[in-house]
Interface confidence: low
Amino acid sequence: EDELQVIQPEKSVSVAAGESATLRCAMTSLIPVGPIMWFRGAGAGRELIYNQKEGHFPRVTTVSELTKRNNLDFSISISNITPADAGTYYCVKFRKGSPDDVEFKSGAGTELSVRAKPSAPVVSGPAVRATPEHTVSFTCESHGFSPRDITLKWFKNGNELSDFQTNVDPAGDSVSYSIHSTARVVLTRGDVHSQVICEIAHITLQGDPLRGTANLSEAIRVPPTLEVTQQPMRAENQANVTCQVSNFYPRGLQLTWLENGNVSRTETASTLIENKDGTYNWMSWLLVNTCAHRDDVVLTCQVEHDGQQAVSKSYALEISAHQKEHGSDITHEAALAPTAPLLVALLLGPKLLLVVGVSAIYICWKQKA
């Protein structure tokens, strides 16, 4: 009779994680008598997966009834496959011996590869904000996928990016893999509402890629532009100077007024106007009692934005010769109008200016007397 052959018809089997894998094995003869065993790997380090003779293998079931007379099918099914189950499986026939069974013949092996989905991509941006025209890096990570082949793309507002570098680890063969990609993005002033997207395509996703996103609002700082102007006033001894702080992001902003270099008032931006591009505007104003000054006044609007170094804009307030003549040497305390919402300004503004104006004229008159 021909010598027994161990036939493993499939060289490879690919299974999705969580599914069951069927590993086929058949014998060509009933002789010699003895059990079969399944191993993962070959050589001294091989791992026993199933022993027909003894042992408890809860994840392994036999495809046919092995105790059935004349059975030559020794296929097995392994349930709940994970990436750790990947490897080459050998069906091995043993010959009955005393005291131990002796390995007789092995099948050629079936390579089990496990298809595991990548985890949802996690995109992270820079630790510190950067200003427009600067380049920032975003990273994208995904783990636990198999096989190794994977495609990663970066987009900014739907436009594909090209400046990125991607690594799939580990470098050698493994049960599962991780991908790490770093993209470089040049910021523009309009990027407060922009988004970067990391898109991952893998065989396990059946054409429906995974996406991770990050908002550039977390990475950008748009510094403000300042404009200081004098507003027309009804009262002759009053000057209303405004500081328009425009197109800044994020919100955090502190403004200080200085008169001839001396701090007059500090305030924190509260009621902001949001622009279409996501940046903010804010206005502060300073009411100056001009009759309290003999000389021209340099008013400075100094803004500290998002913890950065202060920027400032100055305005020279001219004191007319008539006012200089009536001025005095007493310490000046500017009459300051609080920065208030637009509605309050419109309703109370004229009344407040009238009161302040009359008071100023009275003070000037009293000083003269």
Partner: antibody
Framework: QVQLVQSGAEVKKPGASVKVSCKAS????????MHWVRQVPGQGLEWMGW????????KYSQKFQGRVTITRDTSATTAYMELSSLRSEDTAVYYC????????????WGKGTTVTVSS | DIQVTQSPSSLSASVGDRVTITCRAS??????LNWYQQKPGKAPKLLIH???SLQAGVPSRFSGSGSGTDFSLTINSLQPEDFATYYC?????????FGGGTKVEIK
């Protein structure tokens, strides 16, 4: 026994190219990767790239990308490393080393090929 | 890219001493770390692979340990032939990278 035999020393002018060969014997050539590592005189080891001899998958170090080309001829069981646009700082000993497919350790090394770049 | 920092860069020891060289990776690399010995004018020689597996034919006085980011190579009872430069190498991620080397000299 397993061995890697490298081609002889080379002297090249700046801007030229050099091609170093590495003949493998004593093992199944297609079952391993072949790494290329260089060592500038008095300095440490620097990985340049690898080729998986079985499927010709190649990976280069970003530092050499565009200048290095690694190839293999399975029938001749030989790997090649070509470095172009040579500059004086490319003067070094260039090693080929057999690589394991999983941990990517380099268990067998060639004796090295000295490449001198001088005008 | 993963950086591998080796320390010390050099050390002096006597025959019979126990010597330890450390290697730190800039991110976790599991056990994908290998150790090599190089003597002047010679190619490097693999001592340890996968952080702690002794390569065939390497004397048992060499041992490796560690996982994640911190690794070490220990030579128990230093022998005259052990005076050389030792390199660690990470093989977790490309580009593969080597430590700067540790030169073990005779005291």
């Amino acid at each position: 026994q397993v061995q890697l035999v490298q081609s002889g020393a080379e002297v090249k002018k700046p801007g030229a190219s050099v091609k170093v060969s590495c003949k493998a014997s004593g093992y199944t050539f297609t079952s391993n990767a072949m790494h290329w590592v260089r060592q500038v005189p008095g300095q440490g080891l620097e990985w340049m790239g690898w080729i998986k001899a079985g499927n010709a998958e190649i990976k280069y170090s970003q530092k050499f990308q565009g200048r290095v080309t690694i190839t293999r001829d399975t029938s001749a069981t030989t790997a090649y490393m070509e470095l172009s646009s040579l500059r004086s700082e490319d003067t070094a000993v260039y090693y080929c080393a057999r690589g394991d497919y999983y941990y990517y350790y380099m268990d067998v090394w060639g004796k090295g090929t000295t490449v001198t770049v001088s005008s | 890219d993963i950086q591998v920092t080796q320390s010390p860069s050099s050390l002096s020891a006597s025959v019979g001493d126990r010597v330890t060289i450390t290697c730190r990776a800039s991110q976790s690399i599991s056990d994908f770390l290998n150790w090599y010995q190089q003597k002047p004018g010679k190619a490097p020689k693999l001592l340890i692979h996968a952080a702690s597996s002794l390569q065939a034919g390497v004397p048992s006085r060499f041992s490796g340990s560690g996982s994640g980011t911190d690794f070490s190579l220990t030579i128990n009872s230093l022998q005259p032939e052990d005076f050389a430069t030792y390199y660690c190498q990470q093989s977790y991620s490309t580009p593969l990278s080597f430590g700067g080397g540790t030169k073990v000299e005779i005291k």
